[in-house]
């Protein structure tokens, strides 16, 4: 789960997730509350929803390890694993490319953003 996600985000965005995204804004990293601060933060909020859905389906999102291929800038999720593994890969692929699409609006000030400042309605899934 987490190891897959970190590797995938680094490959797609070119950034070290632990330095750039975990945490970032109000939703990137563990947990999440309030209104997302920018497009990058929205990526993470959507990813949280993706994980929440898999949890309701009985998937072990942090334990399940999946296989995927990264080539020529694209991610191919393997169809070899279980249903949960395949869906987890799809969630992670989506957030990785979402973060890449929004690199141009990445704000360093939102890195280590103080979570008590995360106010407003938390978006529903």
């Amino acid at each position: 789960g987490i190891l897959n996600l970190n590797k995938m985000v680094k490959q797609v965005t070119g950034k070290m997730p632990i330095l750039s995204y975990w945490p970032y804004g109000c939703h990137c990293g563990l947990g999440g509350r309030g209104q997302p601060k920018d497009a990058t933060d929205w990526c993470c909020q959507t990813h949280d929803c993706c994980y929440d859905h898999l949890k309701t389906q009985g998937c072990s999102i942090y334990k399940d390890y999946y296989r995927y291929n990264f080539s020529q800038g694209n991610i191919h999720c393997s169809d070899k694993g279980s249903w949960c593994e395949q869906q987890l890969c799809a969630c992670d692929k989506e957030v990785a490319f979402c973060l890449k699409r929004n690199l141009d609006t990445y704000q360093k000030r939102l890195r280590f953003y103080w979570r008590p400042h995360c106010r407003g309605q938390t978006p529903g899934c």
Epitope: D64, W83, C84, E85
Partner: antibody, heavy 120, light 106 residues
């Protein structure tokens, strides 16, 4: 027509290594998406999945038996192999190989099975 | 791992009778697969992705369910349906089978 056929020693002694062969025709294990699995069934009991091997030589094992299992393949000869080390009487069963249905996770074609008896 | 519990373990039905075999999963799964095994034969694929009949399976068979509860139904029992039926999941690793339901002709 897709067919699979298992072969094995029939009878072996406790603590020995069981070697099984699955010979198949009608498909190639070099085709992307293909996989062959081993499944066993003790007499009068249910089915237990043992291992998969994929077209790209990736392998998966049942965690409860992983330390004793080795799955391998010879793509050019259309064969898949399974080795089980340190067998005992609880490994007495009919052993099946089966092909994964393309793009799904069920077994669309099964072999006829080979009966293995482990004597103490 | 996900444990699949089939019920009943053994049942008998008369020709023409409706039959329902249940498979309960220890945690939620998205798809269930079913196999039929006649005595002395290897299992045959019977139902895939919960409700799709495998090639050659008579239309009197159907599959349904969601979450932790799945079933295989025969609308009208025939002599050739006497067999053992197994459910299977690969929602999460490892792939597991139910213990089977033996269906006998009354």
């Amino acid at each position: 027509q897709v067919t699979l056929k298992e072969s094995g020693p029939g009878i072996l002694q406790s603590s020995q290594t069981l070697s099984l062969t699955c010979s198949f025709s009608g498909f190639s294990l070099s085709t992307s998406g293909m996989a062959v699995s081993w499944i066993r069934q003790p007499s009068g009991k249910g089915l237990e999945w043992l291992a998969h091997i994929y077209w790209d030589d990736d392998k998966r094992y049942n965690p409860s038996l992983k330390s004793r299992l080795t799955i391998s393949k010879d793509t050019s000869r259309n064969q898949v192999f399974l080795k089980i080390t340190s067998v005992d009487t609880t490994d007495t069963a009919t052993y099946y190989c089966a092909r994964r249905g393309p793009g799904t996770w069920y077994f669309d074609v099964w072999g006829t099975g080979t009966t293995v008896t482990v004597s103490s | 791992q996900i444990v699949l519990t089939q019920s009943p373990a053994i049942m008998s039905a008369s020709p023409g009778e409706k039959v329902t075999i249940s498979c309960s999963a220890s945690s939620s799964v998205v798809y269930m697969y079913w196999y039929q095994q006649q005595p002395g034969s290897s299992p045959k694929p019977w139902i895939y992705r919960t409700s799709n009949l495998a090639s050659g399976v008579p239309a009197r068979f159907s599959g349904s369910g969601s979450g932790t509860s799945y079933s295989l139904t025969i609308s009208s029992m025939e002599a050739e349906d006497a067999a053992t039926y197994y459910c299977q999941q690969y929602h999460s690793s490892p792939l597991t089978f139910g213990a089977g339901t033996k269906l006998e002709l009354k």
